[in-house]
């Protein structure tokens, strides 16, 4: 999978007045990285292992960064036109991408009450625009206001993709988010399921990084994939993952099925608890 | 309009230790980070630390981690630095400062110059 | 700790004359550098944040630049009241450090 930084900011409006402050979140590979706390105006990393990709710096950059473009998003749902009364809200999700032939990505996109309504592609500075008319009219009164405001011009587009893939090679430069493998914790459990029926549910916890293997075998043979249920890997929080493999087996059999787990080199097997 | 009151001086005896106060008003006390900076004689500034007043986060330099223990009392809009142990080489002027932005301080008291001695 | 190395130690101007500090940091603190003066007897005033970034209510004499490891702070025209110490202080690592300070005097 290719190294990701992935910016996430939020402004609201009540009325048609634009609130004070702003919503950030940033994600390092697909991990909450960053968020900005509104109450004490810093950039706080997410977790011990965000604390250690910048070591002994104070998160200065991370905050101004964040301050401006939340500044700037207010600007932008400042010159949307229909607002109506009540809540609604503004987002901005920009992401850059380091991929393993080194080759970059970058792209921003903007939605208004939850809804999509302009991407662009940062390298050839490509928009593009859903089909539907209030996307359409949406999308038209945010890049006319981006095209007046000089510092929107071509070399600010340059500029957001040059930063975002600046800030992700310092922060892949630690070497935390590179070297680190933090091996899963795996637990089995067993829930009763219907008469004669168990469940049987194996969970991998706090590893990273995200790639891992998780199966049920019967007799040393891994079950086929209908008969098993997989959950998603999901960020945990503390820049880890877990995930989920369960299985519906007869019960008596238990000592026939082993849960199989593989990660980084690695793997396992996981007898059901009798 | 901000300010930050400190007392002018106090005088310590060496290992009795000492708290410092700077009693904010003008602005809203649970906002804004407060830095306290040491400044012996004739030399320049060390920053000792900072303390959120909403909820008591710190951050000190590590210099100063058995030396000074910050503390808020958001009733009174009341910073505290309290100076364990302290020796001669304890003797400076210290100062509470407000921050504007982050780690820029915009404010400043007018300094408390503490005498340790006998 | 990242150690900033002001100079000269002492400059002795005449009032009107334009001046400039130096401000050297250890390693490359981006532009988080902040300017500060104070003068006898008094608490330190924030003069310049973020190396140029200006202050409300600091005379537009004074003015930042610089960036990585080398920073400046010039007056374009001296004054009497601009007698003072001058410091720099980085924010982007800890702990927060100042420099030893520059004295202005005139001549």
């Known amino acids: 999978e290719p190294h990701s930084l992935r910016y996430n900011l939020t402004v609201l409006s009540w009325d048609g007045s634009v609130q004070s402050g702003f919503l950030a979140e940033v994600h390092l590979d697909g991990q909450p990285f960053l968020r900005y706390d509104r109450q004490k105006c810093r950039a706080k990393p997410q977790g011990q292992w965000a604390e250690d990709v910048l070591g002994n710096k104070t998160w200065d950059r991370e905050t101004r960064d964040l301050t401006g473009n939340g500044k700037d998003l207010r600007m932008t749902l400042a010159h949307i036109k229909d607002q109506k009364e009540g809540l609604h809200s503004l987002q901005e999700i920009r992401v850059c991408e380091i991929h393993e032939d080194n080759s970059t990505r970058s792209s921003q996109h903007f939605y208004y009450d939850g809804e999509l309504f302009l991407s662009q592609n940062l390298e050839t500075e490509e928009w593009t625009v859903p089909q539907s008319s209030r996307a359409q009219t949406l999308a038209m009164n945010v890049r006319n206001f981006l095209k007046e405001d000089a510092m929107k011009t071509k070399t600010h587009y340059h500029a957001m993709h040059a930063d975002c893939l600046q800030e992700l090679r310092r922060y892949l430069e630690s070497g935390v988010v590179l070297r680190r493998t933090v091996p899963p914790m795996v637990n089995v459990t067993r829930s009763e399921a219907s008469e004669g029926n168990i469940t049987v549910t194996c969970r991998a916890s706090s590893f990273y990084p995200r790639n891992i293997i998780l199966t049920w075998r019967q007799d040393g043979v891994s079950l086929s994939h209908d008969t098993q249920q997989w959950g998603d890997v999901l960020p945990d929080g503390n820049g880890t993952y877990q995930t989920w493999v369960a299985t519906r087996i007869c019960r008596g059999e238990e000592q026939r099925f082993t849960c199989y787990m593989e990660h980084s080199g690695n793997h396992s097997t996981h007898p059901v608890p009798s | 309009q901000v300010q930050l009151q400190q007392p002018g001086a106090e005088l310590v005896r060496p290992g009795a230790s000492v708290k410092l106060s700077c009693k904010a008003s003008?602005?809203?006390?649970?906002?804004?980070?407060m830095n306290w900076m040491k400044q012996r004689p004739g030399q320049g500034l060390e920053w000792i630390g900072m303390i959120h007043p909403s909820d008591s986060e710190t951050r000190l330099n590590q210099k100063f981690k058995d030396k000074a223990t910050l503390t808020v009392d958001k009733s009174s809009s009341t910073a505290y630095m309290q100076l364990n142990s302290p020796t001669s080489e304890d003797s400076a002027v210290y100062y509470c400062a407000r921050e504007m932005g982050p780690y820029t301080l915009d404010y400043w008291g007018q300094g408390t110059s503490v005498t340790v001695s006998s | 700790d990242i150690l900033l190395t002001q100079s000269p130690a002492i400059l002795s101007v005449s009032p009107g004359a334009r001046v400039s500090f130096s401000c050297r940091a250890s390693?490359?603190?981006?532009?988080?550098i902040h300017w500060y003066q104070q003068r006898t007897n008094g608490s330190p005033r924030l003069l310049i944040k973020y190396a140029s970034e200006s202050i409300s209510g600091i005379p537009s004499r004074f003015s930042g630049s610089g960036s990585g490891t080398d920073f400046t702070l010039s007056i374009n025209s001296v004054e009497s009241e601009d007698i003072a110490d001058y410091y720099c202080q980085q924010s982007n690592y800890w702990p927060l450090t100042f420099g030893a300070g520059t004295k202005l005097e005139l001549k």
């Open positions: 003008g602005y809203s006390f649970t906002s804004y980070w």
């Open positions: 390693q490359n603190i981006d532009t988080s």
